[in-house]
Interface confidence: low
């Protein structure tokens, strides 16, 4: 099957990196500079993707693979194979159409994108407030008043833990 | 073959400003960054930062954003670095060398010797 | 900046052994990392890309692996012409930077 295919199309034959050249006998020519194509058998390259302004090239583009982009230090990816870049915001805080916003009162965040979430509602479980919550930080329920009668043991908060990923640079 | 073609030395006085070369050859210089590298004696790597020659776009490390200029000439598929204000400190080997994320071919290097 | 750190500052072994280079990074950096080996009086010379990928022309016993901050460089039976300084160096954010270096020694 394979070699009736290349009989009949001649352009089977030709590798990733590059296409079939019409105006050339369907010869295979390479993929010209800055773009590429990552299967056989293609009739033209594909463009590279260029990784610039606030996106920065991950993985450089080759004559088989496109280019891959991430975010400039202070920015973050959005969408399939980082088609955006959102700015980043402190932990404690929201981006809105207007910039960086500190979270309301009664919500947290403790990442640098995404949005502000309420705190536990620690009292729907049946549970008191151990430790307060925080603009960066959600609040730490602990037992019920019932289950701190004398005798029962103390509880020690946990103390906070690093987020990974947010370490300073 | 991919060569990166930098001057032996350069001997200069301090104050004054130095331009040192990366002749490109064997691959199509306006596809590849061109960074720069500096290399105190019996020390380490420092990046000083690189130049896309396609747009001329550059990207510096800060310590060097007053010392180091990064210029290409696409005719010539020439680098240049000038380096401005010199002292002692700037006594160094310097390298060029090709590529994006991982620096894959390298030239040889120019020792700077700054010296009244 | 990202701190690189290398360690040990000197590895001596002898020939035949398998060395291990460490570099860990000061932040998360997935698998951003090159390795170099420096001759004496050379240019460094690219021996891994992206933590673990092989580059064409150099020798199979060098290897790399690791990612998010942890990376190691691998060489299996080490020869006499191996006596290098290595450096890795990450690429995950301007600027560049290297780690301080290993020396490798022959015993």
């Known amino acids: 099957f394979e070699r009736t295919r290349s009989l009949q199309d001649p352009c089977s034959n030709c590798p990733a990196g590059t296409f079939c050249d019409n105006n050339r006998n369907q010869i295979c020519s390479p993929c010209p500079p800055n773009s590429f194509s990552s299967a056989g058998g293609q009739r033209t390259c594909d463009i590279c993707r260029q990784c610039k302004g606030v996106f920065r090239t991950r993985k450089e583009c080759s004559s088989t693979s496109n280019a891959e982009c991430d975010c400039t230090p202070g920015f973050h990816c959005l969408g399939a194979g980082c088609s955006m870049c959102e700015q980043d915001c402190k932990q404690g805080q929201e981006l809105t159409k207007k910039g960086c916003k500190d979270c309301c009162f009664g919500t947290f965040n403790d990442q640098k994108r995404g949005i502000c979430r309420p705190w536990t509602n620690c009292s729907l479980d049946g549970k008191s407030v151990l430790v307060n919550g925080t603009k960066e930080r959600d609040v730490v329920c602990g037992p019920s008043p019932a289950d701190l009668s004398p005798g029962a043991s103390s509880v020690t908060p946990p103390a906070p833990a690093r987020e990974p990923g947010h370490s300073p640079q | 073959q991919v060569q990166l073609q930098q001057p032996g030395a350069e001997l200069v006085k301090p104050g004054a400003s130095v331009k040192l070369s990366c002749k490109a050859s064997?691959?199509?210089?306006?596809?590849?960054?061109i960074n720069w590298v500096k290399q105190r004696p019996g020390q380490g790597l420092e990046w000083i930062g690189n130049i896309y020659p396609g747009n001329t776009g550059t990207n510096y490390n800060e310590r060097f954003k007053t010392k180091a200029t990064l210029t290409v000439d696409i005719s010539s598929s020439t680098a240049y670095m000038r380096l401005s204000s010199l002292t002692s400190e700037d006594s160094a080997v310097y390298y060029c060398?090709?590529?994006?994320?991982?620096?894959?071919?390298w030239g040889q290097g120019t020792t700077l010797t700054v010296s009244s | 900046d990202i701190l690189l750190t290398q360690s040990p500052a000197i590895l001596s072994v002898s020939p035949g052994e398998r060395v291990s280079f460490s570099c860990r990074a000061s932040?998360?950096?997935?698998?951003?990392i090159q390795w170099y080996q420096q001759r004496t009086n050379g240019s460094p010379r690219l021996l891994i890309k992206?933590?673990?990928e092989s580059l064409s022309g150099i020798p199979s016993r060098f290897s790399g692996s690791g990612s998010g901050t942890d990376f190691t460089l691998s060489i299996n039976n080490v020869e006499s012409e191996d006596i290098a300084d290595y450096y890795c160096q990450q690429s995950h954010s301007w600027p560049f930077t290297f780690g301080s270096g290993t020396k490798l020694e022959i015993k």
């Open positions: 060398a090709r590529g994006q994320l991982g620096l894959d071919y």
């Open positions: 064997g691959y199509t210089f306006t596809n590849f960054w």
């Open positions: 992206y933590a673990s």
């Open positions: 932040q998360i950096i997935g698998t951003t």
